[in-house]
Interface confidence: low
């Protein structure tokens, strides 16, 4: 239904502290190098312009689109030749042209400085002095790392935010209090913040047909007792809220999810029995809940699949009918009927049966010729069982830093181009599938492993794309969305590979290594890990294991030292010179 | 066969505009990046600008930096560069060549350039 | 001021080996492929040597390239008459975020 002011229509759907919050958002997932307060007060005045909208909707410029009305604010900034580049011709373009041209400047590895943690003291004092500020400050600060964050999402995590500081600033010891809560939402967000990237990768590099099928894969193992018609409702919705969302409609997606949440909940009966918690909840944690609910109990006595897709008469004739609802029903029937095999893994299968299709059905005897496509499917079944099954059994053995290191000399061979920090970030991720899912009974382990290697490697896909420099990736990203991951498993050492010149500075290390925490330790020997395979991409796992631990008991023994600088650069420089005799270099 | 031309080069006074395109034709143009290269009288190569697959990603020489403007129109297998602001010191044979299906590929196929003249 | 580095010009006869030196920084050639190109008056440029040492498709033999650590090389061995161009090196800069050149080598042939 048209509105006479789309920003009047917002601005009374979602309240004013909602609107606000995902202007905010939205502008500092544009602008992200822009100012706390410059943004601060480009929001102030769209809310205080969207008041007036409400006041009078016939106003002057309140029937604009909000692409148009966010679109001419931010174009307002006077340094945006300056910080942003050509990123400013995009204020020369008309809309749509203008939202897409800022939309492809979005970066996903800004050039932005860590976020450091004050002292529990210092944040409670900043949090009791400006509450809205200091809220404000972490809304921008999220957002303008994570310019796909799913902006609704970041309004539950600011009230999880909020909540803590309330409670822990009043503890006895708030910091055993907050650190934990705050480690506990950093870790969430990143994670969260990975999940969404692929989502819209998904549907800005595949289209809207690849997201629908993820979603009517995972919807169905979600709600196996809900119809396919429900499912195919939700999926429609689903894609709306994240299509809107990736695009930058942070207002619209907002609106949008609080409507399907309550449609949800009005229609929980024929949906799922799991939902009945979520549902009692606020608006945000009853979206966050639903997003999250475990999967409903399968129906029992669920026909074989064969009777409908393989051995009627009609596969053919109701193929032709409606391609895409029957490959959908095909998806849903078999995901309701296996919560044990990840989305990835079905969506895979789906499309050996669409191949399998478009080959019969025009064959002489369509019936003879798919028979026996099930059987196709067992090779494609058993290589994702067969990985993980080998994976954990090298976690439990290895310990997680030990796998991730083994994974990064893989990881290192296969695609050496990569950037050094991009390979360390990408294969500490990958090795955390261990400790998140190795610990998981058979039934769970691939839809927790494989779908979660899809996140990280797309986070691998949307780096690499920035600055491409390795072909290898390019075309496991580019090829199929569903078949990157066994693309990567598949690949061998590049032989192609010159390896990095031998430069004793990259292992040149001082005593600072021996404040940093355990974790910033650990990065700093993985990316000499990888810098040693960069130059040495032969060597074998006794040749890296013997230079590491040199290197680990090095840095402890330095650590010890009364006067460390100088053991760092004497042992140093023994250090290089034995893993150059080592590796042969 | 792989076929690059350039067209609207020109004489221009400085300060000037002008906008070139390369018509591509005999490979899938929408797969590889795409480059702008230029050579100044009596001087070597010199690299202008670079487009990604998509038009998402877009690098440029310092020289250039926010007076160039590189684009491509995937359904129309066509290169764009748009100069505005134009110096003396852009007077250059402009070379539109197609990259690889990285930003670092060779330059596997050249047009056969378009004069462009700066000069009141 | 070109980024990589060659040699301006270079001469030598017919049937001889030649080599031309390209020298740039761990943020160009150390850490990216080098490509060079061959350019004739008049004509546009030519890929000739790419990804290091791959040569584009109907280069002759003759022609190779190879690279160690933050400096490239083209080879030419027997040279003829027709070789006689620029010849130019390239690859990308990671701290430029760009593509760069060398300043070009004159090759005559005696």
């Known amino acids: 239904d048209a509105h006479k002011s789309e920003v009047a229509h917002r601005f009374k759907d979602l309240g004013e502290e909602n609107f606000k919050a995902l202007v905010l958002i939205a502008f500092a997932q544009y602008l992200q190098q822009c100012p706390f307060e410059d943004h601060v007060k480009l929001v102030n005045e769209v809310t205080e312009f969207a008041k007036t909208c409400v006041a009078d909707e016939s106003a002057e410029n309140c029937d604009k689109s909000l692409h148009t009305l966010f679109g001419d604010k931010l174009c307002t900034v006077a340094t945006l030749r300056e910080t942003y580049g050509e990123m400013a011709d995009c204020c020369a373009k008309q809309e749509p042209e203008r939202n897409e041209c800022f939309l492809q400047h979005k970066d996903d590895n800004p050039n932005l400085p860590r976020l450091v943690r004050p002292e529990v003291d210092v944040m409670c004092t900043a949090f009791h002095d400006n509450e809205e500020t200091f809220l404000k400050k972490y809304l921008y600060e999220i957002a303008r790392r994570h310019p796909y964050f799913y902006a609704p999402e970041l309004l539950f995590f600011a009230k999880r935010y909020k909540a803590a500081f309330t409670e822990c600033c009043q503890a006895a010891d708030k910091a055993a209090c907050l650190l934990p809560k705050l480690d506990e939402l950093r870790d969430e967000g990143k994670a969260s913040s990975a999940k969404q990237r692929l989502k819209c990768a998904s549907l800005q590099k595949f289209g809207e047909r690849a997201f629908k099928a993820w979603a009517v894969a995972r919807l169905s193992q979600r709600f196996p007792k809900a119809e396919f018609a429900e499912v195919s409702k939700l999926v429609t919705d689903l894609t709306k809220v994240h299509t809107e969302c990736c695009h930058g409609d942070l207002l619209e997606c907002a609106d949008d999810r609080a409507d399907l949440a309550k449609y949800i909940c009005e229609n929980q009966d024929s949906i799922s029995s799991k939902l009945k918690e979520c549902c009692e909840k606020p608006l945000l944690e009853k979206s966050h809940c639903i997003a999250e609910v475990e999967n409903d109990e399968m129906p029992a006595d669920l026909p074989s699949l064969a009777a409908d897709f393989v051995e009627s008469k009609d596969v053919c004739k109701n193929y032709a009918e409606a391609k895409d609802v029957f490959l959908g029903m095909f998806l849903y029937e078999y995901a309701r009927r296996h919560p044990d095999y990840s989305v990835v893994l079905l969506l895979r299968l789906a499309k050996t049966y669409e191949t399998t299709l478009e080959k019969c059905c025009a064959a002489a005897d369509p019936h003879e010729c798919y028979a026996k496509v099930f059987d196709e499917f067992k090779p494609l079944v058993e290589e994702p069982q067969n990985l993980i099954k080998q994976n954990c059994e090298l976690f439990e053995q290895l310990g997680e830093y030990k796998f991730q290191n083994a994974l990064l000399v893989r990881y290192t061979k296969k695609v050496p181009q990569v950037s050094t920090p991009t390979l360390v970030e990408v294969s500490r991720n990958l090795g955390k599938v261990g400790s998140k899912c190795c610990k998981h009974p058979e039934a769970k382990r691939m839809p927790c492993a494989e779908d979660y290697l899809s996140v990280v490697l797309n986070q691998l896909c949307v780096l690499h794309e920035k600055t491409p420099v390795s072909d290898r990736v390019t075309k496991c990203c580019t090829e199929s969305l569903v078949n990157r991951r066994p693309c990567f498993s598949a690949l061998e050492v590049d032989e192609t590979y010159v390896p990095k010149e031998f430069n004793a500075e990259t292992f040149t290390f001082h005593a600072d290594i021996c404040t940093l925490s355990e974790k910033e330790r650990q990065i700093k020997k993985q990316t000499a890990l990888v810098e040693l395979v960069k130059h040495k991409p032969k060597a074998t796992k006794e040749q890296l294991k013997a230079v590491m631990d040199d290197f680990a008991a090095f840095v402890e023994k330095c650590c010890k030292a009364d006067d460390k600088e100088t053991c760092f650069a004497e042992e140093g420089k023994k250090l290089v010179a034995a893993s150059q005799a080592a590796l042969g270099l | 066969e792989v076929q690059l031309v350039e067209s609207g080069g020109g004489l221009v006074q400085p300060g000037g505009s002008l906008r070139l395109s390369c018509a591509a034709s005999?490979?899938?143009?929408?797969?590889?990046?795409m480059y702008w290269v230029r050579q100044a009288p009596g001087k070597g190569l010199e690299w202008v600008s670079v487009i990604n697959t998509s038009g998402g990603s877009t690098y440029y020489a310092d020289s250039v930096k926010g007076r160039f403007t590189i684009s491509r129109d995937n359904a129309k297998n066509t290169l764009y560069l748009q100069m505005n602001n134009l110096k003396s010191e852009d007077t250059a044979v402009y070379y539109c060549a197609k990259g690889g299906l990285v930003v670092a590929g060779g330059l596997g196929s050249w047009g056969q350039g378009t004069q462009v003249t700066v000069s009141s | 001021q070109p980024v990589l580095n060659q040699p301006p010009s270079v001469s030598g006869s017919p049937g001889q080996k030649f080599t031309i030196s390209c020298t740039g920084s761990s943020s160009n050639i150390g850490d990216n492929y080098v490509n060079w190109y061959q350019h004739l008056p008049g004509t546009a440029p030519k890929l000739l040597i790419y990804?290091?040492?791959k040569r584009a498709s109907g280069v002759p033999d003759r022609f190779s390239g190879s690279k160690s650590g933050t400096s490239a090389s083209l080879t030419i061995t027997e040279l003829q008459a027709e070789d006689e161009a620029d010849y130019y090196c390239s690859s990308w800069d990671d701290s430029l975020s760009g593509l760069v050149f060398g300043g070009g080598t004159r090759l005559t042939v005696l």
């Open positions: 005999g490979f899938t143009f929408s797969s590889y990046w």
């Open positions: 990804d290091n040492t």
